[in-house]
Interface confidence: medium
């Protein structure tokens, strides 16, 4: 036999145990709440924080860039590449043919505003990507200099000089005060680079990177 | 849809699940202890072995950790 | 961590979180189940009403929806 | 060897007109490179005024406005300086350089002219 | 227009020793890896001769104990060590913008 239990006893020890039970419950959803927001937020912010960041960047060059074609780039959703919409894409680049003659300075100043550069080729295949979009009776100039005027040649982003992979005219470069690169027609020898003058206004090839969002 | 999307509708209907069932498990065990207490009250003394019994049922269940 | 990362993670956390919880919930309710077979069997026809009226409440338990 | 010589009147009375001549020899002025015009006033600050180019083109300092001009003889390799309304500012000693193409730093000098302008 | 300020205005160094000048530019004076910024040596009753050119390189025939660095809006003119003939003022020039301007000058005295 058990000794029997008060009502008032037993009503207490119920609020009691019904107290810790919800208690539980609360403590438990609370974790769940905290779990499922962290999930949702902070990704969110963190990716909110990318988009910010990439705006910002888009904001800067928004007066130039109103808009922009962008692909998607890989199975994921968020995975868009884009380049401003008069731009070309090739690889991970956008290219800009620019009509407006200036000099290889002022040329490179108005790409840099831009966000981008005078165009640094590294490969032949980006060479033949780009003059497909050139005229054969204009030069554009490239991100190719030779400040100090003694052969030592430097592309405008810091990529390397490397004499395998230049495609100069047969001949060029020809003079030590020519400190510029440029990409014309030749007909007997089709496209290729050639040294000239910097201050002589040309056409110009910007080159940025892609935009990714 | 992508693959991040199809995961944080999982984690909502997860959530939710979460939420209800403990809600539902919470519910559930005061009613058992109130029917206990409730079974204890109504029998005449005869059964207090019973009575007590059922109360030792839902004193281990009280207890009990769930499995890790 | 990355983004789909965090996410998987914690579905991991819920879906367990639920796992363990239905089977609290199953056990629980087994348990309440097999309590009221036993009162039933044990009480001597008395008490029958008393017994019925427990089943009865498990009865509502079982049949009843979660909150909305 | 590139040489310049600077030439032109020491002494200039102030609203007149400057002219000075630089005579390059050891290069031609029509085969490349800017070919400027800088002076220095007495506390030693150093002012670029402008160039003429090798194809003609120039380009000249905003803070002189109109009155300045650089204009060229190409058979006789020279190029010229001429500032108009001068006044006792520009009393300073003028330079012609040759400046490189790119990345335009001024490589040959010639020995500069001294003028005062003074009534 | 760009404005170049050079310090100190005046320099007193021992023989041997490093001379050091400082030019600031008014805004960033480089184009990537290409740095505006020339040098130039002017000693009394001569025209100023180019040492440096775009930040670092050495105009042929300037000694080797002349080097420049620099990027931006900061450059520096270094001599190590410095030699009786060093005396002079030297300038620093920019081609990064029209119109090209210098700075004032410090004046290098040799103890």
């Known amino acids: 036999m058990v000794p029997e239990e008060e009502p008032q006893d037993r009503e207490k020890g119920l609020w009691w145990f019904q107290l810790k039970v919800w208690s539980m419950a609360v403590v438990s959803i609370l974790l769940l709440s905290v779990c499922f927001t962290v999930s949702s937020v902070v990704p969110h912010n963190f990716m909110y924080s990318k988009t910010v960041k990439r705006l910002s960047k888009l904001r800067e060059y928004q007066q130039y860039h109103p808009s922009l074609t962008c692909v998607m780039e890989g199975k994921d959703i968020e995975d868009w590449s884009c380049c401003p919409t008069p731009w070309t894409s090739f690889q991970s680049s956008c290219y800009f043919i620019s009509t407006g003659m200036q000099s290889w300075t002022k040329s490179q100043k108005n790409c840099s505003v831009m966000g981008a550069d005078l165009v640094v080729i590294n490969t032949r295949e980006e060479q033949d990507f780009i003059i497909q979009n050139l005229k054969r009776n204009s030069s554009y100039f490239l991100g190719l200099s030779d400040p100090g005027g003694r052969r030592h040649w430097q592309w405008v982003d810091q990529t390397p000089y490397n004499e395998n992979v230049t495609f100069w005219h047969s001949g060029e470069p020809n003079n030590l005060d020519e400190r510029c690169a440029i990409i014309n027609f030749r007909s007997s020898e089709e496209w290729g680079w050639n040294d000239i003058h910097c201050h002589v206004p040309q056409k110009s090839i910007c080159k940025m990177k892609k935009i990714y969002i | 849809l992508g693959e991040p999307q199809l995961c944080y509708i999982l984690d909502a209907i997860l959530f939710l699940y979460g939420i209800v069932l403990t809600l539902l498990y919470c519910r559930l065990k005061i009613q058992v202890r109130k029917a206990a207490i409730t079974s204890y009250e109504k029998s005449d003394g005869v059964y207090t072995g019973l009575s007590t019994r059922n109360q030792e049922t839902y004193e281990t269940l009280k207890h009990e950790k769930p499995p890790q | 961590l990355g983004e789909p990362q965090l996410c998987y993670i914690l579905d991991a956390i819920l879906f367990l979180y639920g796992i363990v919880l239905t089977l609290l919930y199953c056990r629980l309710k087994i348990q309440v189940r097999k309590a009221a077979i036993t009162s039933y069997e044990k009480s001597d026809g008395v008490y029958t009403g008393l017994s019925t009226r427990n089943q009865e409440t498990y009865e509502t338990l079982k049949h009843e929806k979660p909150p909305q | 060897d590139v040489q310049l010589q600077e030439s032109g009147p020491g002494l200039v009375k102030p609203s007149q007109s400057l002219s000075l001549t630089c005579s390059v020899t050891g290069y031609s002025i029509t085969s490349g490179y800017y070919w400027n015009w800088i002076r220095q006033f007495p506390g030693n600050k150093l002012e670029w005024m402008g160039y003429?180019?090798?194809?003609?083109?120039?380009n000249y300092n905003p803070s002189l406005k109109d009155r300045f001009s650089i204009t060229r003889d190409t058979s006789k390799n020279q190029f010229f300086l001429k500032l108009n309304s001068v006044t006792t500012e520009d009393t300073a000693t003028y330079y012609c350089a040759r400046g490189v193409d790119y990345p335009k730093a001024m490589d040959w000098w010639g020995q500069g002219t001294s003028v005062t302008v003074s009534s | 227009d760009i404005v170049l300020t050079q310090s100190p205005a005046s320099l007193a160094v021992s023989l041997g020793q490093r001379a050091t000048i400082s030019c600031r530019a008014s805004e960033s004076v480089s184009m990537h890896v290409t740095h505006l910024i020339h040098w130039y040596q002017q000693k009394p009753g001569q025209p100023p001769k180019l040492l440096i050119y775009?930040?670092?390189n050495l105009e042929s025939g300037v000694p080797a104990r002349f080097s420049g660095s620099g990027s931006e809006t900061d450059f520096t003119l270094n001599i190590h060590p410095v030699e009786e003939e060093d005396a002079a003022t030297y300038f620093c020039?920019?081609?990064?913008?029209?119109?090209?301007?210098f700075g004032g000058g410090t004046k290098l005295e040799i103890k």
């Open positions: 775009v930040a670092s």
């Open positions: 003429i180019s090798f194809d003609g083109t120039y």
């Open positions: 020039q920019q081609s990064f913008e029209d119109p090209w301007t």
